[in-house]
Amino acid sequence: MMTGTIETTGNISAEKGGSIILQCHLSSTTAQVTQVNWEQQDQLLAICNADLGWHISPSFKDRVAPGPGLGLTLQSLTVNDTGEYFCIYHTYPDGTYTGRIFLEVLESSVAEHGARFQIP
């Protein structure tokens, strides 16, 4: 029985050119995490394997950095990065847990609306 829950950073609004951290945390289970996949739509961004470590997809190598922890740092954000990101936890013996984070990347001019941008 799958008892775990995934907590995420929550949805994020950020400014074009900035960087953000996507993080998920699996709790309420003793299952062993064997691998975490980070995906956007149907694209694989990165894998963190318990034995093999990190692998960043070649097309994202310039803008994606592993960590902190099992999280992912997205840099040099573009408006095209707007979308839903998935952290997929592969565990044993529970199976797969998925967390979802929506990232909205805005042009700087939108700051006129008073939106508070997050740039770590």
């Epitope: 949805n11 609004s13 707007t82 805005l106 770590p120």
Partner: antibody, heavy 119, light 112 residues
Framework: EVQLQQSGPELVKPGASMKISCKAS????????MNWVKQSHGKNLEWIGL????????SYNQKFKDKATLTIDKSSSTAYMELLSLTSEDSAVYYC????????????WGQGTSVTVSS | DVVVTQTPLSLPVSFGDQVSISCRSS???????????LSWYLHKPGQSPQLLIY???NRFSGVPDRFSGSGSGTNFTLKISTIKPEDLGMYYC?????????FGGGTKLEIK
């Protein structure tokens, strides 16, 4: 002036599929997400999902993942929601609503499309 | 999914009254960068819903200052001072911090 004009009411048979349109005007269509909301029994509101006109990306409430398909036609600034394999549970008013940038909310709503599923 | 609980379900008022509507979430609506995405809407009979408050406490353009929002974390409040006839209808809160977005069950503001 921001306007979202939805297609008219529909009476459809169980098992059928249908598509609702939402024509946007008065703003840059590709600059804002388009959200869809279901209102059942004149009360409860449920977020179905959104589409990003800029890149075609979508985000669905998993409850509606196999029920609704969101698409857009950039050339006509129109968003569409197709409802699949309709049952009486799908009888409701459906709204399109423009995303409010930077705040994960919606600021302008269409007038709603009433869908009645009945044999 | 985040459960959003609104109270009361029904709120009988007299014109000129001040009222509060509460919205509570099953988990914190503050994201890792300190932003909280909680908005309020009014749905009048025969109309589309309209945005009143976004980001907890920001009034949308054209919304009278008798509407105010407050709160943090999991507890939020919409206050309406000096109720007017055009304020009657269903009020909903919406959390947009976590996927999927979820609405409160609604509060009906009606005349006593």
């Amino acid at each position: 002036e921001v306007q979202l004009q939805q297609s008219g009411p529909e009476l459809v048979k169980p098992g059928a599929s249908m598509k609702i349109s939402c024509k946007a005007s008065g703003y840059s269509f590709t600059g804002y997400t388009m959200n869809w909301v279901k209102q059942s029994h004149g009360k409860n509101l449920e977020w179905i999902g959104l589409i990003i006109p800029y890149n075609g990306g979508t985000s669905y409430n998993q409850k509606f993942k196999d029920k609704a398909t969101l698409t857009i036609d950039k050339s006509s600034s129109t968003a569409y929601m197709e409802l699949l394999s309709l049952t009486s549970e799908d009888s409701a008013v459906y709204y399109c609503a423009r995303g409010f940038r930077g705040y994960f909310a919606v600021d302008y709503w269409g007038q709603g499309t009433s869908v009645t599923v009945s044999s | 999914d985040v459960v959003v609980t609104q109270t009361p379900l029904s709120l009988p008022v007299s014109f000129g009254d001040q009222v509060s509507i509460s919205c509570r979430s099953s988990q914190s609506l503050t994201n890792s960068y300190g932003n909280t995405y909680l908005s309020w809407y009014l749905h009048k009979p025969g109309q589309s819903p309209q945005l009143l408050i976004y980001g907890i406490s920001n009034r949308f353009s054209g919304v009278p200052d008798r509407f105010s929002g407050s709160g943090s974390g999991t507890n939020f409040t919409l206050k309406i001072s000096t109720i007017k006839p055009e304020d009657l209808g269903m009020y909903y809160c919406l959390q947009g911090t976590h996927q999927p977005w979820t609405f409160g069950g609604g509060t009906k503001l009606e005349i006593k």
